[in-house]
């Protein structure tokens, strides 16, 4: 009997979506498996006989609640099936947006890009799929514990009257306000404010 | 099975436009990646385009530039606008619905009645 792929799981990121499995002890040599999509009562193969521990399911629809299914084979032996149920559009994980950041003076002057979806043909962001996407941001003075959020109504974002010659740190997330739903932090950017322009009257 | 119906092909001369039709269900229509195929007399099917529900779209190389997928929402109603035809566009067209969105993934469904366009030089 061939044992079943073991920790099968849906790593999804942007709605690069990668089944994974790992190869259960086989005594007799090589496993090779089997991943299908179900689709209409009828189960479709996407990676057959591959000798990999994932495959890549990123072309599905992303709003259809999918059942996807892996199995492990031997010569004309195989296992069981294992299904895991998979709905992108709540699934996937929203990864960090990219933020410029650019420093006037005692301000910091910052841009969001969307995160890209991987597409054959057009450059999709994740704000074409999610209606209510928006951004949250958080900022504060290095070396301070005390963070600073706010959520801008635009694609950019100044932070002004800043101290000068201070540094400060901003992040950015992706946030989903109608399904209460967060992605992933950028990397923090920290830049040094220099003088406050006001010219003294 | 699903139920798609297909309408809109015709004879037309090269150069020539035509706008192909399919309603589908509500369910088909939502959850699924809807698109179109082509079969040639003694020639393999060939994807020709997909459309998700949020309007992500994919075309074959042999079609980029002159056709264009859409959907109709409130119709529930999937359109292929065909420009610029030629006589190598020549074939019985089927409208698909797949969870998976590749052009591949279209022209393993089962096929339904189609539409034929012809194309005349």
């Known amino acids: 009997m061939v044992p079943p792929p073991e920790n099968v799981r849906m790593n999804s990121v942007n709605f690069k979506n990668i089944l994974q499995w790992e190869s259960p002890a086989f005594a007799k040599g090589n496993l090779t498996f089997t991943a299908q999509y179900l689709s209409y009562r009828i189960f479709q193969d996407k990676c057959m006989n591959t000798t990999l521990t994932e495959c890549d399911f990123s072309s599905l629809s992303k709003y259809g609640d999918h059942t996807l299914r892996v199995r492990a084979e031997f010569a004309d032996e195989h296992s069981d099936w294992v299904n895991i149920t998979f709905c992108p559009v709540d699934d996937t994980i929203i990864g960090p947006p990219g933020m410029q950041v650019e420093v006037l003076a005692d301000s910091l002057h910052m841009r969001f890009l969307a995160p890209k979806i991987e597409n054959e043909y057009e450059t999709w962001t994740m704000k074409n799929v999610y209606n209510s996407w928006t951004y949250n941001v958080q900022y504060w003075k290095n070396g301070t514990d005390e963070k600073f959020q706010i959520t801008p109504q635009y694609d950019f974002e100044v932070l002004r009257n800043l101290e000068p010659w201070t540094t400060y740190c901003v992040q950015v997330r992706g946030f989903l306000p109608d399904r209460n739903k967060a992605g992933e932090w950028s990397e923090p950017v920290c830049e040094q404010t220099t003088h406050d322009e006001t010219v003294p009257s | 099975q699903v139920q798609l119906q297909e309408s809109g092909g015709g004879s037309v001369q090269a150069g020539g436009s035509l706008r192909l039709s399919c309603a589908a269900s509500?369910?088909?229509?939502?959850?699924?990646?809807m698109g179109w195929f082509r079969q040639a007399p003694g020639k393999e099917r060939e994807g020709v385009a997909t459309?998700?529900?949020?309007?992500?779209?994919r075309y074959a190389d042999s079609v980029k530039g002159r056709f264009t997928i859409s959907k109709d929402n409130a119709k529930n109603t999937l359109y292929l606008q065909m420009n610029s035809l030629k006589p190598e566009d020549t074939a019985m067209y089927y409208c698909?619905?797949?969870?998976?969105?590749?052009?591949?993934?279209?022209?393993?469904?089962?096929l339904g009645q189609g539409t034929q366009v012809t194309v005349s030089s």
């Open positions: 509500r369910y088909t229509y939502n959850s699924y990646c």
């Open positions: 698909a619905a797949d969870a998976d969105c590749t052009i591949a993934a279209m022209t393993t469904n089962p």
């Open positions: 459309i998700d529900s949020d309007g992500m779209t």
